[in-house]
């Protein structure tokens, strides 16, 4: 099956202090390789979450990524701050035998728009 990375929401709005879910699904787990979430693009992009076991404060996976045939790579960001605003991308990599993993597909991005906390 052809690999497609889908981020169904173009944008989400969230009040400062609240949490938000960023959705991402894949049509195939092949080729073998990790899925990572980034904010921004190019050289200035920031790694937000990797489904490879590291700990990321305030960011958790929504479903159990270790389950066989799980295609849901959505994440939850807790206690959102204005600094979390930006466009988030769910990116699929292909594992390299010795060289670094190769980025092969990305979702279209989801903008996180942070609203002032209601007083």
């Amino acid at each position: 099956k052809e690999l497609k990375v889908t981020q169904p929401e173009k944008s989400v709005s969230v009040a400062a202090g609240d949490s938000t879910v960023l959705n991402c699904t894949l049509t195939s787990l092949l080729p073998v390789g990790p899925i990572k979430w980034y904010r921004g693009v190019g050289q200035s992009r920031l790694l937000i979450y990797s489904f490879t076991g590291e700990h990321f404060p305030r960011v958790t996976n929504v479903s159990d990524a270790t389950k066989r045939n799980n295609m849901d790579f959505s994440i939850r960001i807790s206690n959102v701050t204005p600094e979390d605003a930006g466009t988030y991308y769910c990116v699929k990599f292909q594992k390299g035998p010795s060289e670094p993993d190769t980025e092969i597909q990305s979702g279209g991005g989801t903008e996180v728009y942070v609203l002032a906390k209601p007083s």
């Epitope: 944008s11 279209g108 991005g109 903008e111």
Partner: antibody, heavy 119, light 108 residues
């Protein structure tokens, strides 16, 4: 049929204000994000601003930030662009554009309205 | 922001000829790229989205290809109504949404 009709353009002096309107029909206006895109004489297209269907999410190009305000009235199926502190470089045809529901490209455009800023 | 560079600036061709328009992105936009046609006095028209998908009602002489940073719009056999200005637009890296500078297809 989708129709977008811009109005409100005209000739103004630098520093003055103008309010553009875009009357939409043929689709469920409140369900779609809307944009303003402009084209200076002899130049290419430049994205100006976008507003989400609910009006909660708003973005501006750096060139107009702090001077232009986008808004919408979903009960009137109308998009607005309030332009303050106008400059000669704001002279352009201003187009109203309806976004696709999945991604940020434009599936329908209006004919545009000409704004001329001149002393 | 992602800069889009279109080439050539002007393409002089005769009806019936094949037109090849290029759009290069300063960084990868995968296939998140659209093409528009603009004619004087008319609303811009969406031709292609997702780099290669034809919009509703667009004749099959228009086709798009490419991914990453290199994209092409091909008009297989030019008809009189195809002489216009064409723009590419990326919607991956945003905001801002960015357009290329345009390619004018004129009658030779």
């Amino acid at each position: 049929d989708v129709q977008l009709v811009e109005s409100g353009g005209g000739v103004v002096r630098p520093g003055e204000s103008l309010r553009l309107s875009c009357a939409a029909s043929g689709f469920t206006f409140s369900s779609y994000d809307m944009n303003w895109v402009r084209q200076a004489p002899g130049e290419g297209l430049e994205w100006v601003s976008l507003i989400s269907g609910s009006g909660e999410i708003i973005y501006y190009a750096d060139s107009v930030k702090g001077r232009f305000t986008i808004s919408r009235d979903n009960s009137k199926n109308t998009l607005y662009l309030q332009m303050n502190s106008l400059r000669a470089e704001d002279t352009a045809v201003y187009y109203c554009a309806k976004e696709n529901n999945r991604y940020r490209f434009f599936d329908y455009w209006g004919l545009g309205t000409l704004v001329t800023v001149s002393s | 922001e992602t800069v889009l560079t279109q080439s050539p600036g002007t393409l002089s061709l005769s009806p019936g000829e094949r037109a090849t328009l290029n759009c290069r992105a300063s960084q990868s936009v995968y296939t998140y790229l659209a093409w528009y046609q603009e004619k004087p006095g008319q609303a811009p028209r969406l031709l292609i989205y997702d780099a290669s998908s034809r919009a509703t009602g667009i004749p099959d002489r228009f086709s798009g290809s490419g991914s990453g940073t290199e994209f092409t719009l091909t008009i297989s056999s030019l008809e009189s109504e195809d002489f216009a200005v064409y723009y590419c637009q990326q919607y991956y890296d945003r905001p801002p949404l960015t357009f290329g500078g345009g390619t004018k297809v004129e009658i030779k």
